[in-house]
């Protein structure tokens, strides 16, 4: 069943699926200029048994050249505003993600794919949580929250995680430190869904090594 | 929670047109598709169009091009159909409708009378 | 345009019974289908997304199966609230479409 609200906000910190169930939807949406074709899919879908799972349907994007445009649509300010990452590159796959059965991994970009994703979270789904770059962990403790069914209703559980202002940077499981952190910090409002950025930043030394940041937006 | 409250029923004139609102909350308005459905006794439902109110696309059923115009105000997260020269045939209850995860408006009654 | 046909446009059953609503696509659409439940006077409320995902507060006694072109809703240990007209809808491709509906009688 699809969760009802969002994971719960935590100041100063942001979330990620490690893995999607069975059941999580995520929206086919297409980067400005483009939009899903008529004949393509609305969303994707994580589907499959116990031992495979994997992302129904394909989204596909086309230019929106021949665009119905009328005086009232009028893009809100923050969609005015340009990215600083404007392409979705390959996403990060955690090592453990393959071994969990009943779970898809974070789903291949699309051609002119938003950079931003919208899921839809389904009962037993669990997101995991870190302080965003220039805060820390104030005390180890469970930094993730799972989608329950209570009484009828879903609800998230609550993530033992307060985040410090300290320049240090808590970690999602086996990731490296974020070389750069996202801009501002989301605002919430009800609904059901999730949106999550896939930045890869690329740093200027020498090295080059490449890390995702997921940033989460509350709808 | 997300709700879509549209506009009260309508009583119009044939060959008049009218103007019927789909106010969202709850959710980004500029993120999904929200649709329109015609309801009438014996005829089911029928999918009018869609309409992407981030960047104003729109999706129309031939059956209902000319006779209906999807636009949205992001500003006010309202959704519109306007439908035109209307006559007894457009009789119905009209329905807003997010696309997917999909969720209804409660319907607006238009009838069309002399 | 895809037609969805309902063969049945009235089902009559008894409160505990289990009862079948069938749903024929008139070429393939995938698992690209959704079932509503309307009550008389209300909007139509979602059961099921991509053939047979329930949404967040349908109970389990709604299921929902299929894939290709034929698909069923299932209602095990039917109740008196269960009253009302069912439509699938495919959503494979443009225009989207509905089947015409079919009434459950509780007897």
């Known amino acids: 069943e699809l969760c009802d609200d969002d994971p719960p906000e935590i100041p100063h910190a942001t979330f990620k699926a490690m893995a999607y169930k069975e059941g999580t939807m995520l929206n086919c949406e297409c980067k400005r200029g483009f939009r899903r074709i008529k004949s393509g899919s609305l969303y994707m879908l994580c589907t499959g048994n116990s031992s495979h799972s994997s992302w129904d349907n394909q989204c596909q994007c086309t230019s929106s050249a021949t665009r119905n445009t009328t005086k009232q649509v009028t893009p809100q300010p923050e969609e005015q505003k340009e990215r600083k990452t404007t392409e979705m590159q390959s996403p990060m796959q955690p090592v453990d993600q393959a071994s969990l059965p009943g779970h898809c991994r974070e789903p291949p970009p699309w051609e002119n794919e938003a950079t931003e994703r919208i899921y839809h979270f389904v009962v037993g789904q669990m997101v995991y949580y870190q302080c965003v770059q220039g805060y820390r962990a104030l005390h180890r403790g469970p930094a993730e929250s799972v989608c329950k069914m209570t009484h009828g209703k879903t609800r998230w559980t609550q993530p033992q995680l307060i985040c410090t202002g300290e320049m240090e940077t808590s970690q999602f499981p086996g990731e490296e430190k974020p070389q750069a952190s996202p801009e501002g910090r989301p605002e919430s409002e009800t609904s059901c869904l999730v949106t999550t950025t896939d930045f890869q930043i690329q740093t200027e030394m020498a090295a080059t090594m490449e890390t995702s940041i997921f940033t989460t937006e509350y709808q | 929670q997300i709700q879509l409250q549209q506009s009260g029923a309508e009583l119009v004139r044939p060959g008049t047109s009218v103007k019927i609102s789909c106010k969202a909350s709850g959710y980004t308005f500029t993120n999904y598709w929200l649709g329109w459905v015609k309801q009438r006794p014996g005829h089911g439902l029928e999918w009018i169009g869609d309409i992407y109110p981030g960047g104003g696309y729109t999706n129309y059923n031939e059956k209902f091009k000319g006779k209906a115009t999807l636009t949205a105000d992001t500003s006010s997260s309202t959704a519109y159909m306007q439908l035109s020269s209307l006559t007894s045939e457009d009789s119905a209850v009209y329905f807003c409708a997010r696309v997917t995860p999909a969720s209804w408006g409660q319907g607006t009654t238009l009838t069309v009378s002399a | 345009d895809i037609l969805l046909t309902q063969s049945q446009k009235f089902m009559s059953t008894s409160v505990g019974d289990r009862v079948s609503v069938t749903c024929k696509a008139s070429q393939n659409v995938g698992t690209n289908v959704a079932w509503y439940q309307q009550k008389p006077g209300q909007s139509p409320k979602a059961l099921i997304y991509s053939a047979s995902y329930r949404y967040s507060g349908v109970p389990d006694r709604f299921t929902g199966s299929g894939s290709g072109t034929d698909f069923t809703l299932t209602i095990s240990n039917v109740q008196s609230e269960d009253l009302a007209e069912y439509f699938c809808?495919?959503?494979?491709?443009?225009?989207?479409?509905f089947g015409g509906g079919t009434k459950l009688e509780i007897k």
């Open positions: 809808q495919q959503y494979n491709s443009y225009p989207l479409t």
